[in-house]
Interface confidence: medium
Amino acid sequence: CKAMHVAQPAVVLASSRGIASFVCEYASPGKATEVRVTVLRQADSQVTEVCAATYMMGNELTFLDDSICTGTSSGNQVNLTIQGLRAMDTGLYICKVELMYPPPYYLGIGNGTQIYVIDPEPCPDSDF
């Protein structure tokens, strides 16, 4: 397995609507045509897969219809957006990139982006 450097921001604050976006950039050493991007969440030493997408270079990322992730790609950069986040989803979100084809297979794992999610205060009851 050949290693590949993956860069991502250290910290991101989710919006009040529970949406967080960050860029995952990989230093592609080969001429990959097919790339797989996986977002992993690490919390309390447990790692779970949030979402994953395989895409052709130059094409859009396609996540499953029920995925909480969307994304776009540009060169060696992937712009990832995670939605539907709540305070309990605060954690370290790790970007994993695999150059699937053609050989050789490259694997890169970022250091993670700490996403902070703050649940919005409920609106006070109104007399109107």
Partner: antibody
Framework: EVQLLESGGGLVQPGGSLRLSCAAS????????MNWVRQAPGKGLEWVSA????????YYADSVKGRFTISRDNSKNTLYLQMNSLRAEDTAVYYC?????????????WGQGTLVTVSS | QSVLTQPPSASGTPGQRVTISCTGS?????????VHWYQQLPGTAPKLLIY???QRPSGVPDRFSGSKSGTSASLAISGLRSEDEADYYC???????????FGGGTKLTVL
């Protein structure tokens, strides 16, 4: 257990067409890239074509480019090779072979092959 | 003509050690791509013998070993046995051809 079963071979006239199939079982088909490799009678192995797991990337040997088309149906766990404008030199046993992607790629598993004979 | 070069034949007596070479170029073995070896017994499909230069799949005896250096690789078979009589092929991915390339094969005869 990984199983690859080729079918569709036979006798065809020069200029004719044939479609080979490879039924796969025992693994998650869509996670693996697949290949066709051929062997002419009494000769060595020759790689023909490859297709990535999603089917989005395809590669061909120069000797078949423009004449052969590789494809896959991940819902049916089946790999195909559409062969058009066949020539006598395409006569061979055609094997489908599974790529391995953990750690690196190599042709890990092979079918038993199907014989294609191009002759008038 | 094959992209990877192998001797067409090799031979040895039972118990002997035999080495088969595989020479490539800067677009395949020399580009850092791994070399894999296949054994083809008469009338059967090729079987993976060595992968990633020197790794043996489960079930392959440790009499078989592989190595790689620069633009070439080699397969060594020690303690030769009659059942080792077969054709042996090396393979690697080629950058410029965007595909797998094979050696022409080496027919091993156990005398």
């Amino acid at each position: 257990e990984v199983q690859l079963l080729e079918s569709g071979g036979g006798l065809v006239q020069p200029g004719g067409s044939l479609r080979l199939s490879c039924a796969a079982s025992g693994f998650t088909f869509s996670s693996y890239s697949m290949n066709w490799v051929r062997q002419a009678p009494g000769k060595g192995l020759e790689w023909v074509s490859a297709i990535s797991g999603s089917g989005g990337s395809t590669y061909y040997a120069d000797s078949v480019k423009g004449r052969f088309t590789i494809s896959r149906d991940n819902s049916k766990n089946t790999l195909y090779l559409q062969m058009n404008s066949l020539r006598a030199e395409d006569t061979a046993v055609y094997y489908c072979a599974r790529d391995r992607v953990e750690m690196n790629q190599w042709l890990a598993d092979w079918g038993q092959g199907t014989l294609v004979t191009v002759s008038s | 003509q094959s992209v990877l070069t192998q001797p067409p034949s090799a031979s040895g007596t039972p118990g002997q050690r035999v080495t088969i070479s595989c020479t490539g170029s800067s677009s395949n073995i020399g580009a850092g791509y791994d070399v894999h070896w296949y054994q083809q017994l008469p009338g059967t499909a090729p079987k993976l013998l060595i992968y990633r230069n020197n790794q043996r799949p489960s079930g392959v005896p440790d009499r078989f070993s592989g190595s790689k250096s620069g633009t070439s690789a080699s397969l060594a078979i020690s303690g030769l046995r009659s059942e080792d009589e077969a054709d042996y092929y090396c393979a690697a991915w080629d950058d410029s051809l965007n595909g797998w390339v094979f050696g022409g094969g080496t027919k091993l005869t156990v005398l």
